[in-house]
Interface confidence: low
């Protein structure tokens, strides 16, 4: 009996196309489950199978590649449409084998329908563009592949519903977009529909990506500690619930992994015998900056947990620091009577 | 570099069921199968079958089919062999065995687990 | 199932010579999917060859492996005090895995 590696659904790899334009699947064997490509397969002896599940059926079903002008084909490890349907939307399976050799896995297509302004239920990828810092460049994505280099299409780019002409800061360069300096007021979803000819018929291929303008890394500083501070002591009597808020700036920084976190005499509070709860909140800046504040609280404080050393840390790409927070134990106010009347010599 | 530990030696008696676990750490664990392979003392290697965690795709040999029960809970990266129905000759070393891609060879083994099956 | 049969059963050599190992499998191993495995007794099988010829990391490079279709060739050129051990072939292309019975490397 022969072993098929069954990858399932690669729902990892939730492909969306849009109606009534072309697109080309690559088989996801190749590129994410195996070491070897479709060449070395080929070569090898092994068939590339493809078949497909309509939606909301459980029948698998070959595809037909014998349709009017050969609208699904296949070549090599990519499976073509010219162009998709609605219709289209299904689970896909791309299988490798031979009479003792078998690995398949299946994964999602989703044809979607956009409208005049370009507005569907794909899920957009995001470009990141650092505010005034001089020339940066969009580039039309997923676009390779799918016409010869001696084809010159034409490429249009929209911002939004508004095809980009005579714009102040945003200039077409075929299929790049240069922004001379990104600002705010640049963010945004920004389309380009390239055309191109093919075997006497013509072909659109639309995409769109958010741009979002986030802080440039030439004002990015290592993380700043508002709090604790210098000005704010934590004066606590046995028996109260202490609170010491940790709240930390830190500038955007692409790719940087920005961290909070306190330590209780030098140890992490996990490693502390007290019932400490620790919560976090995050909240962004228009251009991403990051300010994290993590509570530190112990509901029923003791003259012991007064005594520890409480320092909030913090680290991102740009650095670490950390700050120690100013914990005392309240010195109880005299209760007239006694004390105060001892301190008079009263007997 | 990622390591597979196994559970410890096991005596069980004739008719029973053992569970071996492995357990991944310091690498990716759901991608790639993980096998489970014995060997009966004196004796040479035997294949049983597999599974590829993120999937729960198990499929094992045909002489333990039935008799075995291959799953993997990706939460603790930790995968398992159950055989029951245990006679004498089950008697054997259990090792997992993590396959480095899709039909690629077992590049990391388990220290692997004694099972001793004796009245 | 691909049956795989080692030769010879035991091999009895001096530290330095050549260890020549074969495997023959009963039907032709799919996209050369073929492995050596390396065994010191107590110890669990540690991986020398994948795909008939390629050194598994930090393999030294006095283990090669050669062949195609259905008959395969470990060889290691000079033999190390640490080689004597019991050496295995797999196919892993078609199901069941299948292993050879074992080449014993024994000093002479």
């Known amino acids: 009996s022969e072993r098929c590696d069954d990858w399932g659904l690669d729902t990892m790899r939730q492909i969306q196309v849009f109606e009534d334009e072309p697109a080309r699947i690559k088989c996801p064997l190749f590129e994410h489950f195996l070491k070897f490509n479709y060449s070395t397969a080929h070569s090898a002896g092994l068939t590339l199978i493809w078949y497909w599940t309509r939606q909301d059926r459980d029948l698998e079903e070959p595809i037909n590649f014998r349709l009017p002008e050969n609208r699904i084909s296949k070549e090599k490890d990519v499976l073509w449409f010219r162009p998709t349907l609605l219709n289209d939307t299904g689970n896909y399976t791309c299988m490798l084998r031979n009479t003792t050799y078998c690995s398949k896995v299946a994964f999602p297509l989703e044809v979607v329908q956009k409208d005049s302004c370009f507005n569907s239920p794909m899920k957009l990828p995001v470009h990141k563009l650092y505010i005034e810092y001089g020339i940066q460049r969009i580039t039309c994505p997923n676009v390779d592949g799918y016409f010869p280099s001696s084809v010159k299409p034409t490429i249009t780019w929209y911002m939004g519903c508004y095809k980009i002409q005579n714009f102040n800061n945003v200039i077409p360069e075929g299929m790049n977009l240069s922004f001379l300096i990104a600002f705010i007021s640049n963010n945004g979803n920004y389309t380009c529909v390239v055309t191109y000819p093919e075997n006497g018929r013509t072909f659109h291929l639309t995409r769109t990506l958010t741009v979002k303008v986030v802080g440039s890394p030439k004002n990015a500083v290592p993380p700043v500690i508002h709090s604790p501070n210098d000005h704010v002591v934590y004066e606590k009597e046995p028996g109260e619930e202490l609170l010491i808020p940790c709240t930390v700036y830190f500038s955007f920084l692409m790719d940087s992994r920005n961290e909070v976190w306190w330590t209780i005499d030098g140890k992490k509070p996990d490693d502390i015998p007290i019932d400490v709860t620790i919560n976090e909140s995050i909240s962004h800046s228009r251009t991403e900056d990051e300010t994290r504040t993590q509570i530190l609280s112990i509901k029923k404080v003791t003259s012991e947990d007064l005594k520890r050393s409480y320092v909030c840390h913090a680290r991102s790409a740009k650095g670490e620091v950390a700050k120690a927070a100013t914990v005392k134990q309240k010195v109880p106010a005299p209760r007239y009577t006694v004390e105060l009347a001892c301190g008079f010599g009263a007997t | 570099q990622v390591q597979l530990l196994q559970s410890g030696a096991e005596v069980k008696k004739p008719g029973s069921s053992v569970k071996v676990s492995c357990k991944a750490s310091?690498?990716?664990?759901?991608?790639?199968?993980i096998d489970w392979v014995r060997q009966a003392p004196g004796q040479g290697l035997e294949w049983m079958g597999g599974?590829?965690?993120?999937?729960?795709?198990?499929n094992s040999a045909q002489k333990f089919q039935g008799r075995v029960t291959i799953t993997a809970d990706k939460s603790t990266n930790t995968a398992y062999m159950e055989l029951s129905s245990l006679r004498s000759e089950d008697t054997a070393v259990y090792y997992c065995?993590?396959?480095?891609?899709?039909?690629?060879?077992?590049?990391?083994w388990g220290q692997g687990t004694m099972v001793t099956v004796s009245s | 199932e691909i049956v795989l049969t080692q030769s010879p059963g035991t091999l009895s050599l001096s530290p330095g010579e050549r260890a020549t190992l074969s495997c023959r499998a009963s039907?032709?191993?799919?996209?050369?999917?073929l492995a050596w495995f390396q065994q010191r007794p107590g110890q669990a099988p540690r991986l020398l060859i994948y795909?008939?010829?390629r050194r598994a990391t930090g393999i030294p490079d006095r283990f090669s492996g050669s062949g195609s279709g259905t008959d395969f060739t470990l060889t290691i050129s000079r033999l190390e005090p640490e080689d004597f051990a019991v050496y295995y072939c797999?196919?892993?292309?078609?199901?069941?895995?299948?292993f050879g019975g074992g080449t014993k490397v024994e000093i002479k």
């Open positions: 065995a993590r396959n480095g891609a899709t039909s690629d060879a077992f590049d990391i």
């Open positions: 310091g690498g990716t664990f759901n991608i790639y199968a």
């Open positions: 599974i590829i965690p993120i999937f729960g795709t198990a």
């Open positions: 039907q032709s191993v799919s996209s050369n999917y």
């Open positions: 795909g008939v010829s």
């Open positions: 797999q196919q892993y292309g078609s199901s069941p895995l299948t």
